[in-house]
């Protein structure tokens, strides 16, 4: 009985043509949606003039269908038992699942102004930037449509820079018609306990963004894990969105459409400061913003974003230190809504339901030479938006799963 089931499972979770795993792996059978909530700034003038707390009001959800494209350039390597691929990016707006349209306007931080002032610290260069900011009538904040903010717009200030720079700015620009990877993952043929574990990403085993173990590409991409998952396991996975590997721990048993699954969650410890979690020392890359590595709950990924001061956190600064959220009014973190979880069917290791939640923030600092940042008295990690990417196994697939996997075991 059990041995036969194990043998069947081992055979069917291998990533090669003809297996159940492979079919669902190449093109996910699950509908995946990415919901966005934008933080609309209510008091831009007061912030710019008096360095007041930033008052934000979240607006959303604005929903896009994502991950509907099949993996590309899927290539098996029989020698090292790996399969390589590109994960193409695509997003389709879903008006019926959204509170408004892509043309809705938001008052948000001026991404180009914040980024340029951070990248170019030289005071003379900042004076040049100041001239261009003034000339383009740009300010610390800007009004942008959802479409512009997410997918890109031509920035008027950057358009005046007299040497070659990318003048298109957007939080996810470029996205459509791009791909993530190349990923090279173990196909499990020789060792099923390695199936779906990433061997290399973009041709490397390390990211080059972090020091020491923080730079490692660990585990899978979280879409699946090697089979026979135990509750005691710490599940490692790599997320290119946050430019790092992270981990999830068992939280509870959940029944998903009649299928027993394990709910694994990202623990607060993963976001802790090195003071509380020494393993995180290498995610602290500078001493000033992090208050000598005592701040927690925000991750500086600027090295992964061409120097732009992007900080990733959980929505509403969940699990973040009070100093991070103190300058921002209007945030209400709660675990249920804002944490990330994976519901994993333990026998196959497949993720049958997930909610990936993260927040994109941008650092803006006072600048003596940039007029629109001159009156700031403190640094702000400004929330721009948060997202909830979810997928749940469809009813038909769940029936199939129950009959072919869990039903056979029970």
């Amino acid at each position: 009985g059990d041995l036969l089931i194990q043998k069947t499972i081992k055979k069917q979770v291998v990533l090669e043509e003809g297996t159940i795993a492979f079919k669902n792996w190449v093109k996910t059978g699950t509908e995946v949606y990415r919901q966005f909530w934008i933080f609309d700034v209510q008091n831009p003038q007061e912030v710019m003039m008096n360095s007041s707390n930033i008052q934000v009001k979240q607006r959303g959800p604005y929903t896009y269908r994502v991950r509907f494209l099949a993996k590309e350039n899927v290539t098996q390597d029989a020698e090292d038992n790996t399969v390589s691929f590109l994960q193409p990016n695509g997003a389709i707006f879903e008006p019926s699942l959204s509170v408004g349209t892509e043309a809705d306007n938001f008052t948000v931080l001026n991404l180009a102004v914040a980024a340029a002032s951070h990248i170019y610290q030289n005071q003379f260069v900042q004076m040049i930037l100041n001239s261009l900011i003034n000339k383009s009538k740009s300010s610390m904040f800007q009004v942008r449509t959802l479409r512009e903010l997410l997918w890109g717009y031509r920035d008027p200030f950057l358009s005046l820079v007299p040497y070659p720079v990318t003048t298109t700015v957007g939080l996810f620009y470029p996205y459509n018609n791009t791909a993530d990877g190349v990923y090279k993952v173990f196909n499990g043929k020789d060792n099923i306990s390695k199936v779906a574990i990433i061997d290399t990403y973009k041709g490397k085993r390390n990211l080059s963004y972090w020091e020491s173990h923080c730079d490692m590409i660990n585990g899978t991409d979280a879409a699946s894990f090697p089979p026979f998952v135990e509750k005691s396991q710490v599940l490692q996975f790599f997320s290119s969105d946050i430019c790092r590997s992270i981990y999830a721990v068992f939280e509870s048993d959940v029944n998903l459409k009649g299928i027993p699954v394990y709910r694994f969650v990202l623990p607060s410890k993963a976001f802790a400061s090195p003071v509380e979690n020494p393993d995180n020392y290498c995610f602290c890359t500078e001493k000033i913003i992090s208050k000598n590595c005592t701040s927690y709950g925000v991750l500086d990924i600027s090295k992964c974003k061409e120097g732009r001061p992007v900080y990733i956190s959980l929505p509403h600064f969940l699990y973040a230190s009070p100093d991070v959220s103190e300058p921002i009014d209007g945030l209400n973190p709660n675990e249920e809504e804002h944490r990330t979880y994976l519901d994993i069917e333990p026998i196959t290791g497949f993720t049958l339901q997930f909610a990936k939640r993260l927040q994109v923030n941008l650092l803006v600092k006072p600048s003596e030479k940039i007029q629109v940042l001159k009156n700031l008295k403190r640094n702000y990690i400004v929330p721009i938006l948060w997202l909830n990417e979810t997928g749940t196994i469809g009813d038909e697939k769940a029936n199939m799963f129950r009959s072919q996997v869990t039903g056979k075991i029970n």
Epitope: Y120, N122, Q123, F124, V125, I128, Y163, E368, K374
Partner: antibody, heavy 115, light 107 residues
Framework: EVQLVQSGAEVKKPGSSVKVSCKAS????????MQWVRQAPGQGLEWMGG????????AYAQKFQGRVTLTADKSTSTAYMELSSLRSEDTAVYYC????????WGQGTLVTVSS | ETTVTQSPAFMSATTGDKVTISCITS??????MNWYQQKPGEPPKLLIS???TLRPGVPSRFSSSGYGTDFTFTINNIESEDAAYYYC?????????FGQGTKLEIK
Amino acid sequence: EVQLVQSGAEVKKPGSSVKVSCKASGYRFSDYEMQWVRQAPGQGLEWMGGIDPETGGIAYAQKFQGRVTLTADKSTSTAYMELSSLRSEDTAVYYCTRKLDFDYWGQGTLVTVSS
Amino acid sequence: ETTVTQSPAFMSATTGDKVTISCITSTDIDDDMNWYQQKPGEPPKLLISEGNTLRPGVPSRFSSSGYGTDFTFTINNIESEDAAYYYCLQSDNLPLTFGQGTKLEIK
């Protein structure tokens, strides 16, 4: 010790161009911008423009826009100021000077424009 | 453009005297004012930089004050070697602009 050494005096005809060099030593050239200032005989100081060798960022005073070109060669730690369409009122001592606060100055290059 | 109005254009003093030079700017420049001394045939020399900061090696008889639009440069206990032209420069915004200069003569 920081030193800025400029090229020698020049006599130029009206309508021609002049290129003044400024060789820096004693510090990492790309760490600081180079500014250019001129001083006509018996007159005050006038800022012409500046260049940041690291980023290539350049700013010119409106008065010189289109006539002055600033360049910097990181490999030789040398900054250059070229002024074209010279007229008699461009007769002056031209200085290169480091940073926003002009903390170190070259010895000056006298450019005489005369027919 | 920030214009800088420097006064007086000329002043005469005796050794041991105290003199002050004023620079007024057309816009608020915080404390981004610099002061220079220039002797005949020499390039200017930075005495005081932004934030009223006396440069290393500059005698303490030189000082400055001011913030916003009104700035004052002071020489206490004047010595004969202080005979020179003095210039102020605003480094808050582009274009960088100088005052017209003050000629200090020692009697």
